[in-house]
Amino acid sequence: EPPTACREKQYLINSQCCSLCQPGQKLVSDCTEFTETECLPCSESEFLDTWNRETRCHQHKYCDPNLGLQVQQKGTSETDTICTCEEGLHCTSESCESCVPHRSCLPGFGVKQIATGVSDTICEPCPVGFFSNVSSAFEKCRPWTSCETKDLVVQQAGTNKTDVVCGPQDRQRA
């Protein structure tokens, strides 16, 4: 009775269960009753990352420097090349096919999370007591200056974009 289903790491072909090719190898010829599945290793610039019956290996991804990409991890016969973006850039998608410059946080906003090769800058509004007066991809919200610790008083209140202005305390007349 010919099989209708096969074990793990096997495939059904013409009423016969054949072994799949291991990662890093492609299918040359299906098995027979007498011969095991014929598989061949992928060439230098190719890979297959699963147990498979592919007759062609996949080409390694090219990290195009013209798109701001660089190699993060070189591909093997079993893994694809992993690209990342050059300094100051991040990927536009999960597959990282191109890069864009990191965004800066505008005045009134600070950097919550610094950008990486794969994620953009995350900004947050400066809460009360903090400010940012620059457009930056690195600077966090800074705390307002504490006038009291300098024996000074607040002359001008701070905002999310400006620091407080401190001044000397008014002397009380006798």
């Epitope: 013409n14 010829s29 299906d30 098995c31 027979t32 009753e33 007498f34 011969t35 095991e36 014929e38």
Partner: antibody, heavy 117, light 109 residues
């Protein structure tokens, strides 16, 4: 390169025995089934026997069943055909050939067996 | 047992002409497991076509195979001097035995 080389042929009297060998090189012998095919002088091709890659399955043509035995030694990359009770009609060139799902893709050059008194 | 009948027995043609060889099976050949081989005098057979229509490695594309079920054809589009030889079909779907056709000789006219 991938190669099969037969040996062991010769002239033998009817009723006697002969053992043919087929030396394989250039491929992973232990993964492939192997066949013997013969060709009588001036005639067509006749399939003789097949053996599976690990040697557990063997099939024979009716004309040689009970007289011929196919075997293999994977440690020596060699296929054998033990031919007993030889008859005049066994006179032929004997080829070994590699089994694949594409048919017999590699053949040896053949060895001549002549059964004559 | 599947019996394969090849026709014609001999085909007399000139270089440059088209050759059409037939192979008929006594019962259906499953999965089109049919191969064609070329054999020249004093040489071993050489695999040309497998799976009825797939070209074997290193075989020039003037050779082509077609057919399914019980009727199969080998076509040589333009005969070259080196193509004059004997051609055999073989089924490898239903065994034992693996059967060959009787052969077609392609000779120079």
């Amino acid at each position: 390169q991938v190669q099969l080389v037969e040996s062991g042929g010769g002239v033998v009297q009817p009723g006697r025995s002969l053992r043919l060998s087929c030396a394989a090189s250039g491929f992973t012998f232990e993964k492939y089934g192997m066949h013997w095919v013969r060709q009588a002088p001036g005639k067509g091709l006749e399939w003789v026997a097949v053996i599976s890659y690990e040697g557990t399955k063997k099939y024979y043509a009716e004309s040689v069943k009970g007289r011929f035995t196919i075997s293999r030694d994977n440690s020596k990359n060699t296929l054998y055909l033990q031919m007993n009770s030889l008859r005049a009609e066994d006179t032929a060139v004997y080829y070994c050939a590699r089994d694949t799902s594409r048919g017999h893709d590699i053949w040896g050059q053949g060895t001549m067996v002549t059964v004559s008194s | 047992e599947i019996v394969l009948t090849q026709s014609p027995g001999t085909l007399s043609l000139s270089p440059g002409e088209r050759a059409t060889l037939s192979c008929r099976a006594s019962q259906s050949v499953s999965y089109s497991y049919l191969a064609w081989y070329q054999q020249k005098p004093g040489q071993a057979p050489r695999l040309l076509i497998y799976g009825a229509s797939s070209l074997a490695t290193g075989i020039p594309d003037r050779f082509s195979g077609s057919g399914s079920g019980t009727d199969f054809t080998l076509t040589i589009s333009r005969l070259e001097p080196e193509d004059f030889a004997v051609y055999y079909c073989q089924q490898y779907s239903d065994y034992p035995p693996f059967t060959f056709g009787g052969g077609t000789k392609v000779e120079i006219k």
